[in-house]
């Protein structure tokens, strides 16, 4: 039959070349004379001339050494002609499989892996995979399968086995426990690839493991006892720097510390945060202290981390004794503001009051006080007793230094420490109004027609308060009455003033006397301008001149 | 001589607790990894439970998840397992073992725990 | 049932070898070096006899030798003695949580 089996050839053969592989033969071959030849790749047709085939006889041979990791299978067709040239068979189907040989090593992807595991880990715990590539073949033989294991590892600390690698996947994995980034923070491994599954060529690289940190170490302090001392009263005060020490990753969150105030600030007194760069605890006042009240204050300080711990760790814990120093303080006046009814327009020398400071210092310093500020010079005050008096005539009714009936006074107390210090009180004194005002008319110039007068409304103001204002009262006075009448609205807050017989043009005083509810009189004189006109007039017009 | 020494076992109720202790000497305990191993009457040998030698990774069989706790002090030199809602099933010998190298070696002589109401 | 699967009994005489096999897969047995054996009297704790496939620890008997092939480990006791009638437990390492494998037992008996 016209048919070939697949014909085996081993790579890298040694020959002689040209090899007789198999023959080619057609049972056409009785009837005439047959010509074999061959194409495809590998015969006619790149890589030519690797195969060729004696014409006559039909040998199929090769040229030269196979090599399978270059091409491991060739698919040639087998022809044969008459002497004619005239095809006797189809093209025959021969195929050529290069068999392998274990002509390669294993090579790892990487000269060096790189990988991670967190310390303190179990065995059974992935680390990293190894990955090696062998071309030679793996399906059909164990030339290209390779087998990968541990050479060494260093540091042998704790222990000389502990990691270990599967010997097919290449995954490395722990196998035993005692990783401890504090003591070793790496491990070189050399690894090794072996075809043969095990027992063929080997090729090494190396692969490191870096252990990552885990919190395993809590922060102590270093020194456990502080002494410190602050001046009274300072707020934002730095008090002391204490200083841990961590072994575990600079600048992780499992090394940056966490300060707690533990006891001993029982009124809130101080704060502490973290130094972001040297991770001391900053304490720091919130408040002010007092000596007086308490003159040394005795802190606990507990230092965690951000990140929490990964196992049960005893908490270091830190003592702090503040000492707080006395300070001279400044006179403190008790109200701070005080607020004093007094009556207007007392008499000069008259007391007002007395403002008085206390000293929170313990020794009994002399305070002395003066006015600091006095717009209107009012007041005066005695600086051993801190009796204020009146030295001028306190008027409620003063707009430019009275508002809402309150003078401010600003009144200072210093004590005769060293250096002296001054504190400072404000006096308001609320002005008890007096009937010193009289009701005034508004406008005070009216005009008026001599004929159907309008009659004038006059708005009654008077400075005082209620109840010395409205309802007002009104008269005439000098003999205004004459020629005038006033009278006072309902509401008591307006005087109508009418003309009430004819006067010739020209401007007349009314005499206008005006009392409020109190029967403080007051009087006022009314420019009249009386025109010639009837009804309402703004201006007298001029003299009417006829053509 | 590496020694350990088990105790805490006895007769409890299903539902129960029961703390176990290992006591180790002779070895740098918070070096090695621990594990309890359980023998169950007539049956063979069963791990229940591992942890690191800091404490800070720990392992358990399915069949105990959740229920059991594993724990050491190491100032102590001492394995802990915690037992709670205790089943009949659980009823065995338990060892304490030194896990390292992929081998438990050495061994304690054993506590039994008896669940049985 | 156990990870590893051992043979429930074997026997042999005074005098004679046997073997003891321990199979697993791939990714226990066929993966690792790690194998190890134990033997437990009645009454007893567990005591290692062979580690890392092969290696004995000081104190145990040279007639006790392993071997490995593929995904099945082997413990051979040669020279058998009446001491040697006990419970055979073989153990692998395997990576994840549950790192260590347990092989069910095999009664040896000394006839």
């Known amino acids: 039959d016209w048919v070939v089996a697949p014909i085996s050839v081993p790579e890298n053969g040694k020959g002689p070349f040209p090899q007789r592989l198999n023959q080619l033969k057609s049972n056409k071959d009785r009837d005439t004379k047959i010509f074999y030849s061959i194409t495809g790749p590998g015969a006619d047709s790149p890589p030519e001339g690797v195969f060729a085939v004696e014409k006559e006889t039909g040998w199929l041979l090769l040229n030269k050494p196979l090599d399978r990791e270059e091409i491991a299978k060739y698919e040639l067709f087998g022809h044969a002609v008459s002497e004619n040239g005239a095809s006797v068979e189809d093209p025959m189907n021969i195929s050529i499989i290069v068999t392998d040989q274990n002509d390669h090593k294993p090579k790892f992807t990487q000269d060096t892996f790189r990988g991670s595991v967190l310390e303190g880990v179990l065995p059974g715990t992935s680390v990293m995979q190894v990955t090696a590539t062998d071309e030679d073949d793996a399906i059909y033989t164990y030339n290209g399968v390779v087998a990968y294991s541990i050479h060494s590892q260093e540091p042998k600390d704790p222990h000389d086995l502990m990691f270990t690698i599967h010997r097919s996947t290449g995954t490395i994995s722990v196998i035993s426990s005692g990783l401890d980034r504090e003591k070793v923070p790496e491990y070189t491994l050399t690894i090794q690839a072996t075809d043969m599954d095990g027992d063929g060529s080997t090729t090494t690289a190396v692969a490191v493991v870096e252990i990552l940190d885990a919190n395993d170490n809590a922060p102590m302090f270093d020194p456990q006892k502080y002494e410190a001392h602050v001046p009274e009263n300072a707020v934002g005060h730095e008090v002391q720097r204490l200083t841990v020490t961590d072994l575990d990753a600079p600048n992780s969150p499992a090394w940056r510390a966490t300060y707690l105030i533990m006891g001993g600030d029982d009124g809130d007194h101080f704060t502490i945060t973290t130094h972001p760069e040297s991770n001391q605890g900053i304490l720091t006042t919130r408040k002010g202290l007092d000596f007086e009240a308490k003159n040394q204050h005795t802190l606990y300080v507990e230092v965690t981390n951000e990140a929490p711990f990964v196992l049960k760790l005893p908490t270091s814990t830190a003592t702090i004794v503040v000492h707080v120093e006395d300070v001279n303080e400044a006179p403190v006046f008790v109200p701070p503001s005080k607020v004093v009814e007094v009556q207007e327009g007392i008499p000069t020398g008259e007391p007002v009051c007395v403002y008085t400071a206390e000293d929170p210092d313990k020794e009994n310093q002399k305070i002395s006080y003066r006015i600091l500020r006095d717009p209107a010079g009012w007041l005066a005050m005695d600086p051993d007793s801190g009796q204020v008096t009146a030295v001028g005539t306190l008027d409620r009714e003063d707009e430019q230094f009275v508002r809402n009936n309150i003078y401010e006074v600003m009144v200072l107390a210093m004590d005769n420490g060293s250096p002296p210090t001054t504190g400072t009180g404000t006096l308001l004194l609320t002005l008890i109004d007096v009937n010193d005002h009289g009701p005034v008319p508004e406008p005070r110039q009216i005009t008026i027609c001599n004929q159907s007068p309008v009659r004038q409304v006059l708005n009654i103001t008077d400075k005082d308060l209620s109840p010395h204002t409205s309802p007002f009262q009104a008269q005439l006075t000098d003999d205004s009455d004459i020629y005038w009448t006033a009278e006072v609205n309902e509401e008591g807050d307006t005087v109508v003033l009418s003309l009430k017989k004819f006067l010739k043009q020209d401007t007349y005083d009314v005499h206008l006397s005006l009392s409020d509810h109190g029967n403080k009189e007051q009087l006022t004189v009314i420019r009249a301008t009386v025109c010639d006109c009837h009804g309402h007039v703004e201006t007298c017009p001029g003299p009417w001149k006829g053509g | 001589e590496v020694q350990l020494l088990e105790s805490g076992g006895g007769l409890v109720q299903p539902g129960g607790s029961l703390r176990l202790s290992c006591a180790a000497s002779g070895f740098t305990f918070s070096s090695y990894a621990m594990s309890w191993v359980r023998q169950a009457p007539g049956k063979g040998l069963e791990w229940v439970s591992a942890?690191?030698?800091?404490?800070?990774?720990?392992y358990y069989a399915d069949s105990v998840k959740g229920r059991f706790t594993i724990s050491r002090d190491n100032s102590k030199n001492t394995l802990y397992l915690q037992m709670n809602s205790l089943r009949a099933e659980d009823t065995a010998v338990y060892y304490c073992?030194?896990?390292?190298?992929?081998?438990?070696?050495?061994w304690g002589q054993g506590t039994m725990v008896t669940v049985s109401s | 049932q156990s990870a590893l699967t051992q043979p429930a009994s074997v026997s042999g005489s005074p005098g004679q070898s046997i073997t003891i096999s321990c199979t697993g897969t791939?990714?226990?047995?066929?993966?690792?070096?790690?194998v190890s054996w134990y033997q437990q009297h009645p009454g007893k704790a567990p005591k290692l006899i062979l580690s890392e496939v092969n290696k004995r620890p000081s104190g145990v008997s040279n007639r006790f030798s392993g071997s490995k092939s593929g995904n099945t480990a082997s413990l051979s006791i040669s020279g058998l003695q009446a001491e040697d009638e006990a419970d055979y437990y073989c153990t692998s390492y395997t990576m994840g949580s549950t790192f260590m494998l347990f092989g069910g037992g095999t009664k040896l008996t000394v006839l």
């Open positions: 942890i690191s030698g800091s404490g800070g990774s720990t």
């Open positions: 073992a030194d896990t390292n190298s992929a081998k438990f070696d050495p």
């Open positions: 791939s990714n226990d047995v066929g993966a690792y070096n790690y």
